[in-house]
Interface confidence: low
């Protein structure tokens, strides 16, 4: 006959480990007893349990309440045991010794491997701003046994660097994702992916990128200067920009206060029926926490009663 066991039994922390030991005997052979012991090198063999065909299961005090026989139906030639609630300290070598009649004794060893699934954490880097060089976007750390794998899943171009710290029974892996911030990255997901044999599926933590920027400002509304004539209704100027965080807008007149009747509505400056009093230099001031931009335009309101035509100047400044 021979013993059937596994070279390695792998179990996740806190779960029950089945330590297999099955005697494949010839017809008529019987198993008298099965002894299980911890057999790590450098330590004396530590008894776990004794399964006796007549007297049943005896568990040594150190493993009281933790070692059981698998539930029935059980084959009398099966000496497998269940080690309840595996902890990291249970990792190591185990020996199964089977006493049979009439064939004698057999022994086999297996290694119990206790997987400690990681609990990953993701830490965003410093605030990202357009114009920075290579900057840390986020770091992701996971500790487990064996060492977990930490990778990144994203459409964003960047570079990764990993480092690992070994502890007595586990390893921590940290991976950093660096990028050159640009406005196109705004709202893009950056996902840390942690793989480990103790996980049924990869763990994923997603961070949404926020890159601060402020686009150049420009003013629309003066494209056709002939529309800006005395008496025209509904004339307006609109300030165009975009940013993250979203910018606020402020309108001023460079050569004096805003004329009476001129309305400021966020990015839009609305005029009452035009008079020559509305001629002047108007400035749109755009700002967010990251930066500020200015754009100015010169408005010339044409008076049909005057022969001389006037020019419209458009100036943009940062």
């Amino acid at each position: 006959g021979e013993l059937e066991t596994s070279d390695v039994v792998t179990v996740v922390l806190g779960q029950d480990a089945k330590l297999p030991c099955f005697y494949r005997g010839d017809s008529g052979e019987q198993v008298g007893q099965v002894a299980w012991a911890r057999a790590d090198a450098g330590e004396g063999a530590q008894e776990l349990a004794l399964l006796h065909s007549k007297y049943g299961l005896h568990v040594s005090p150190a493993y009281e309440g933790r070692v059981e026989q698998p539930p029935p139906p059980r084959n009398p030639l099966d000496g497998s045991v269940l080690l309840r609630n595996a902890v990291q300290a249970d990792e190591g070598e185990y020996e199964c010794r089977v006493s049979t009649f009439p064939a004698g004794s057999f022994q086999a060893r297996l290694r119990l491997r206790v997987l400690v699934p990681p609990l990953p954490s993701l830490n965003p880097g410093p605030a990202l701003e357009e114009g920075q060089g290579l900057t840390l976007a986020a770091s992701c750390t996971a500790e487990g046994s064996p060492a977990p794998s930490v990778t990144w899943d994203t459409e964003v171009k960047g570079t990764t660097s990993s480092r690992s710290f070994k502890h007595s029974r586990s390893a921590a892996v940290t991976s950093e994702f660096h990028l050159v911030p640009s406005r196109s990255m705004n709202g893009q997901p950056l996902t840390c992916v942690v793989s480990h044999p103790g996980l049924l599926q990869d763990q994923r933590i997603t961070h949404i990128l926020h890159v601060s920027f402020l686009a150049e400002a420009s003013v629309r509304g003066l494209e056709d200067q002939n529309l800006w004539h005395v008496g025209r209704e509904g004339a307006m100027l609109k300030c165009l920009s975009e940013g993250q965080p979203p910018p606020s807008y402020n309108w001023t007149r460079l050569d004096g206060p805003l004329p009476s009747g001129v309305r400021v509505d966020g990015d839009t400056l609305g005029f009452p029926p035009l008079t020559t009093e509305h001629s002047g230099i108007y400035v749109c001031h755009v700002s967010n926490e990251f930066s500020s931009r200015d754009s100015q335009v010169t408005v010339d309101v044409l008076d049909p009663q005057e022969d001389s035509g006037k020019q419209v100047d458009l100036v943009s400044a940062s």
């Epitope: 779960q15 099955f22 139906p73």
Partner: antibody, heavy 117, light 107 residues
Framework: QVQLVQSGSELKKPGASVKVSCKAS????????IHWVRQAPGQGLEWIGW????????KYNERFKGRVTITADKSTNTAYMELSSLRSEDTAVYYC??????????WGQGTSVTVSS | DIQMTQSPSTLSASVGDRVTITCRAS??????VAWYQQKPGKAPKLLMY???NRFTGVPDRFSGSGYGTDFTLTISSLQAEDLAIYFC?????????FGQGTKLEIK
């Protein structure tokens, strides 16, 4: 090769008993468990109980206790399942299966039992 | 009793598709789970045991995984002959219980 051959179909009246046989060949009969499992028409599988012919130990599903008896004859390598006090809901195909040591690896072809007045 | 809940109850897929059937136990059953295939009018046949071990003669397109309460049977490339009902079963504690079955249909 391992084979489990079951007895033929049965038609029974409510309140009667039925005894289904399962003849094993191709392996050492006394070294493996024999389980009995049933399947009502269009339904799933329901475990009834097992016997270990080596020492004639048995275990039954509580749902059938008192109505089912599983036996084995080592001289003919045959296991039996007897179900008494039959009712219409016992109409099913009854299977025997070998287990080694926890998993049902080979099954009989099934025996149809119909309970009808 | 330990309940075994299978999903989906019916699955329609095409030849060559990757198919996954899941089984959830109402409490931990370690890896003491078997999967069976039953073709119309036939007895069940063992496919996988101890969750991830393929039984003798089972094609390697069948694979199993899981531990504790959640288990999966996967067919990597569906063949026409795989039309059947698939059952999971826990062998951890009596009464041994089966999932309600997943009927696999070929599109």
């Amino acid at each position: 090769q391992v084979q489990l051959v079951q007895s033929g179909s049965e038609l029974k009246k409510p309140g009667a008993s039925v005894k289904v046989s399962c003849k094993a060949s191709g392996y050492t009969f006394t070294s493996y468990y024999i389980h009995w499992v049933r399947q009502a028409p269009g339904q799933g599988l329901e475990w009834i109980g097992w016997i270990y012919p080596g020492n004639v130990n048995t275990k039954y599903n509580e749902r059938f206790k008192g109505r089912v008896t599983i036996t084995a004859d080592k001289s003919t390598n045959t296991a039996y399942m007897e179900l008494s006090s039959l009712r219409s809901e016992d109409t099913a195909v009854y299977y025997c299966a070998r287990s080694n040591p926890y998993v049902m690896d080979y099954w009989g072809q099934g025996t149809s039992v119909t309970v009808s007045s | 009793d330990i309940q075994m809940t299978q999903s989906p109850s019916t699955l329609s897929a095409s030849v060559g598709d990757r198919v996954t059937i899941t089984c959830r136990a109402s409490q931990s059953v370690n890896n003491d789970v078997a999967w069976y295939q039953q073709k119309p009018g036939k007895a069940p046949k063992l496919l996988m045991y101890y969750a991830s071990n393929r039984f003798t003669g089972v094609p390697d397109r069948f694979s199993g995984s899981g531990y504790g309460t959640d288990f999966t049977l996967t067919i990597s490339s569906l063949q026409a002959e795989d039309l059947a009902i698939y059952f999971c079963q826990q062998a951890y504690r009596s009464p041994y219980t089966f999932g309600q079955g997943t009927k696999l249909e070929i599109k």
